[in-house]
Interface confidence: medium
């Protein structure tokens, strides 16, 4: 059985479309599971992995390796 584009698995009932945009940053493995691109995490691979050591409480990032501080916090790790 040959599955349609973006369909995977037995019965072709698993759907996965690789994407690299606001809504996700992932490839699809041979089973149709999402595999996050480097620097991204989460079930939809849309959460950037911040700079190592970035305070999870006072820092965040839109892009991998970044560390943006909340108002009132500063430093390389927003700590």
């Amino acid at each position: 059985v040959t599955c349609d584009d973006y369909y995977y698995g037995f019965g072709c009932n698993k759907f996965c479309r690789p994407r690299d945009d606001f809504f996700g940053h992932y490839a699809c493995d041979q089973n149709g599971n999402k595999t996050c691109m480097e620097g991204w995490m989460g079930p939809e691979c849309n959460r950037a992995i911040c700079r190592q050591g970035c305070s999870p409480k006072h820092g965040s990032c839109k892009l991998p390796g970044d560390c943006r501080c909340q108002y009132g916090w500063q430093g390389l790790y927003c700590d």
């Epitope: 759907f15 479309r17 839109k62």
Partner: antibody, heavy 119, light 107 residues
């Protein structure tokens, strides 16, 4: 279970702003973007934009660019949609909505917030 | 931006009828299409995603088909609770636009 609970109805004057909240529960708030969709009385559905609560990245429909601001507070698992320079055509029910676990469509919806713009 | 054209805009049918609603995208959306049902005063409810996959707890009388730019929602045998407004929506690229809706009324 996933729940999205929105703030109550608002009546606003033309030219003013409105800020609608959407409190999420039943999942990890930062794992999924939150979207906003509106529906004018008797009209269809209109996608306005979305936010990635983890990092704060946003995407907006061009129609609303510059007039809508979507934000998120990770500490309270709450998303906000602020619409400025209100006009009568902005009278609508505003919904927050979230995707399902392994697909893109909106499987989870808030109950809707009616915003009435009237002088 | 991809535009979604839904037809018909309204439809009268009877309980037991087979009903078809179509949605045409202005570009290839590669099956990234959903169908929703909405009743007055309620939020939309997801019926079908990825063009043909039934959402949880949706009755099997609902089915979706299509590819490329043309998609169809079929209700094989209308039940009283199916009278509502139906919307398609694409998820290929932002903005994720909806079709104009099809109001399904009792004949």
């Amino acid at each position: 279970q996933v729940q999205l609970v929105q703030s109550g109805a608002e009546v606003k004057k033309p030219g003013s702003s409105v800020k609608v909240s959407c409190k999420a529960s039943g999942y990890t708030f930062t794992d999924y973007e939150m979207h906003w969709v509106r529906q004018a009385p008797g009209q269809g559905l209109e996608w306005m934009g979305a936010i990635q609560p983890g990092g704060g990245g946003t995407a907006y429909a061009q129609k609303f660019q510059g007039r809508v601001t979507i934000t998120a507070d990770k500490s309270t698992s709450t998303a906000y949609m602020e619409l400025s320079s209100l006009r009568s055509e902005d009278t609508a029910v505003y919904y927050c909505t979230r995707r399902g676990y392994d697909d893109y469509p909106f499987a989870y919806w808030g109950q809707g917030t009616l915003v009435t713009v009237s002088s | 931006d991809i535009q979604m054209t839904q037809s018909p805009s309204s439809l009268s049918a009877s309980v037991g009828d087979r009903v078809t609603i179509t949605c045409r995208a202005s570009g290839n959306i590669h099956n990234y299409l959903a169908w929703y049902q909405q009743k007055p005063g309620k939020a939309p409810k997801l019926l079908i995603y990825n063009a043909k996959t039934l959402a949880d707890a949706v009755p099997s009388r609902f089915s979706g088909s299509g590819s490329g730019t043309d998609y169809t929602l079929t209700i094989s045998s209308l039940q009283p609770e199916d009278f509502a407004t139906y919307y398609c929506q694409h998820f290929w690229s932002a903005p994720w636009t909806f079709g104009g809706g099809t109001k399904l009324e009792i004949k």
